[in-house]
């Protein structure tokens, strides 16, 4: 799917607030706080465009931010492995500066028994061995240091941990005679916390466990366990969250029903019920004691573990998630899209917004896409007009201020921002689409009729005209 | 309304085993856990232990050993078993709802006496 | 285990007057991440089942009037009466639910009205 999708930048405008470094005390670590933008509202722009130059004309003093990669390290505990035995690992790129760690959970989807896992093996290695990993690995989105592209937290400390355990980060058992893979996702989250405290984040503030696709669902079923391990070795004081992208699925219906052949057409709750057998899979205890022996698989549904967990969490969905989608027997081949399967996918979409409801922290456009926090362009996405860096800045400001009396939003920061309009890419920020066939980029007019949305029937219930929809969706408002 | 209800023997000899059941209503034992408390008279509350909604269930360490509780979800019952009675098991028995994933009680049964004595 | 100390045991008050318990824990009961306490009070009268008042060290139940305040944070929480009326003659326990098994209790504070 990454190769259908391209990013379009937004018309220039200011971006979210960088993070300000505080003059530290004599022999104290830097350390960044959140701007009180109260003072400037009525001169949001001309400020933005002066602290921007100001990041900019000073970002080149700091040495050791020219160097964009994240080094490899090979745990040193070897018994902690990928799925075929080669020791699991985590890249790293220090800011010592920085009491901020960012730990990025990769995706890749996953494996359920011996014969997928084989085939796994055979044509995705790296997902599942760490013997051909790169020595370093350049920092993208979320995971880059370079304020342009990352406004939100360009200056943490960043560590992207490579997926190899083929196990939605759950798993919990050695290679062995009997056991031909290894399945340690969650272990290896344990090991990297583990040996990451000998560098630097025993000093941590705040460590944002962050993951995409399968690592968005490693970061829900593994956020409050990173918290006890922290709070059981000594550190209660540093403040685990969460960030899950594209990790939030449904066990809904299938649009068509397959049998569970293999791990793209078996449905999820299937390809989870027999994974967490042939891992030993593990999940956080307060959802697992919410449902019977063997029905754990319950809890890597974002929507039944969200409620248990201790540790705040800021969601990520794309309300027309391509991997659910996939999941769900959708496959959008490039013929026009019948009534059935477009009242499906806009329910899909519906059901996701629904889920979403009580989620405070959370970010969901109406796009067909999958995936968004270490894409380069992962700040021109917005929703009711807030890009996702500023977005995740509101919720570092409404954690600050969690412990004041005000649990009433932030004025002008929103948290909570959740498309509200039913089809896919009614939201004119959406990544572009291309076609399959032929990789012509695809305007949204284009794009809906593709889908076989008729823009009378689209535009009937906005109260609108076709071509007042049709300019409305191209200008972007 | 949410509602538990205790129901036990009352008085019992020492070395028998201690049965009460806690019938609950408004609310499902599929959804929520329910914990056991004690209070021997005069003094504070004990907690003893939890059924969860999924059936797992959590004993205090220092009586783990002669307490099971157990649930019938369909007949809306939680069940609480103490064997190896001694007279400082005299007691009220509580049972009470939680709140749905932590250790809050926010309703509780109207409790049931238990003497041990010969 | 978490242990639970309230003091004073006992306190004697005249109606109006206001009334502050204390409740200390062995171990924090603040979880950095969510900065949230792990602690409860309840209140027993005479002959009759404990009631929830407070959650989360300062959340009243509904239903509970608004002269019962909870504080505090870490191992030292307080429950204010901020004018005593005589329904408030019962014994109030602190509970921890940061850790478990077990939940436990702090030995109670008895108001008694003059």
């Known amino acids: 799917s990454e190769g259908r999708k391209t990013w379009r930048r937004r018309g220039q405008q200011p971006p979210p607030p960088p993070r300000t470094e505080a003059a530290p005390a004599a022999g104290q670590p830097v350390e960044s706080f959140p701007l009180d933008f109260t003072a400037v509202e009525g001169n949001m722009d001309s400020f933005m465009a002066q602290v921007k130059s100001l990041a900019q004309s000073l970002y080149p003093c700091s040495a050791q931010q020219l160097n964009e990669d994240l080094r490899l390290h090979l745990l040193l505990n070897t018994s902690v492995t990928c799925n075929d035995g080669s020791p699991a690992g985590y890249y790293l790129k220090e800011s010592r500066g920085s009491r901020r760690w960012l730990l990025f959970l990769e995706g890749g989807w996953y494996c359920f028994n011996r014969e997928n896992c084989d085939s796994r093996y055979d044509t995705m290695r790296r997902l599942m061995s760490s013997r051909d990993w790169p020595r370093t690995r350049t920092g993208t989105g979320i995971l880059s240091s370079q304020p342009e592209e990352n406004p939100y937290w360009w200056n943490a400390n960043m560590v992207f941990i490579p997926y190899c355990s083929s196990d939605v980060w759950s798993g919990a058992s050695s290679k062995s005679e009997k056991n031909e893979y290894a399945f340690m996702g969650a272990l290896i989250i344990q090991e990297v916390v583990r040996e990451l405290l000998g560098r630097g984040l025993s000093g941590a503030k705040v460590l944002l466990l962050a993951g995409s696709s399968a690592g968005g669902t490693g970061v829900l079923l593994n956020v409050d366990r990173v918290a006890e391990q922290l709070e059981k070795l000594g550190y209660p004081a540093i403040q685990v969250r969460g960030l899950a992208d594209s990790g939030w699925f449904l066990d809904n219906k299938q649009y068509r029903h397959t049998d569970c052949v293999d791990t793209i057409t078996c449905a999820p709750t299937e390809a989870i019920r027999r994974g967490i057998r042939y891992w030993n899979g593990v999940v956080p205890e307060r959802c697992r004691r919410q449902f019977q022996e063997g029905e754990e698989w319950n809890c890597f549904f974002g929507y039944k573990v969200y409620p248990t967990l201790r540790c705040p969490v800021f969601v990520v969905q794309w309300l027309f998630d391509e991997a659910q989608l996939t999941v769900d027997n959708v496959h959008l081949t490039g013929q026009p899209v019948q009534e059935g399967l477009r009242l499906y996918i806009q329910n899909l979409g519906r059901e996701l917004r629904h889920t979403l409801k009580d989620v405070p922290a959370s970010f969901a456009p109406a796009c067909l896409s999958h995936e968004i926090i270490i894409r380069s362009h992962w700040t021109d996405v917005q929703v009711k007009g807030t890009s996702l860096p500023r977005a995740l800045h509101c919720w570092d400001r409404s954690l600050h201020d969690s412990h004041k009396a005000s649990k009433t939003p932030l004025k002008g920061c929103p948290v909570h921002l959740v498309d509200s309009c039913p089809w896919p890419h009614c939201n004119p920020s959406c990544p572009t689409v291309r076609d399959q066939f032929t990789g012509q980029e695809m305007n949204v007019a284009q794009f809906l009729m593709h889908m076989g949305f008729d823009m009378q029937t689209v535009a009937q219930p906005q109260g609108l005209e076709p071509s007042e929809l049709l300019g409305m969706l191209s200008n972007g408002s | 309304q949410v509602q538990l209800k205790e129901s036990g023997p009352g008085l019992m000899a020492p070395s028998q085993s201690l049965s009460i059941t806690c019938t609950v209503s408004?609310?499902?034992?599929?959804?929520?856990?329910v914990s056991w408390i004690r209070q021997p008279p005069g003094k504070g509350l004990e907690w003893l232990g939890v059924?969860?909604?999924?059936?797992?269930?959590d004993y205090n360490s220092t009586l783990k050993s002669r307490l099971s509780i157990s649930k019938d979800n369909s007949k809306s019952q939680v069940f609480i078993k103490m064997n190896s009675l001694q007279t400082d098991d005299t007691a009220m028995y509580y049972c009470?709802?939680?709140?749905?994933?932590?250790?809050?009680?926010?309703?509780w049964g109207q409790g049931t006496t238990l003497t041990v004595s010969s | 285990d978490i242990v639970m100390s309230q003091s004073p045991s006992s306190l004697a008050v005249s109606v109006g007057e206001k009334v502050t318990m204390t409740c200390t824990s062995s171990?924090?009961?603040?979880?950095?991440?969510?900065?949230?306490?792990?602690l409860a009070w309840y209140q027993q009268k005479p002959g009759q089942s404990p009631k929830l008042l407070v959650s989360?060290?300062?959340t009243r139940e509904s239903g509970v009037p608004d002269r019962f305040t909870g504080s505090g944070s870490g191992t030292d929480f307080t429950l204010t009466i901020s004018s005593v009326e005589a329904e408030d003659l019962a014994v109030y326990y602190c509970?921890?639910?940061?850790?478990?098994?077990?939940?436990?209790f702090g030995g109670g504070t008895k108001l008694e009205i003059k």
């Open positions: 009470a709802k939680q709140n749905r994933y932590d250790g809050i009680f926010d309703y």
């Open positions: 408004g609310f499902s034992l599929t959804d929520y856990g």
């Open positions: 059924i969860w909604a999924g059936g797992s269930t």
């Open positions: 171990q924090s009961l603040l979880f950095s991440s969510n900065q949230k306490n792990y």
């Open positions: 989360w060290a300062s």
């Open positions: 509970q921890q639910y940061y850790s478990y098994p077990p939940w436990t």
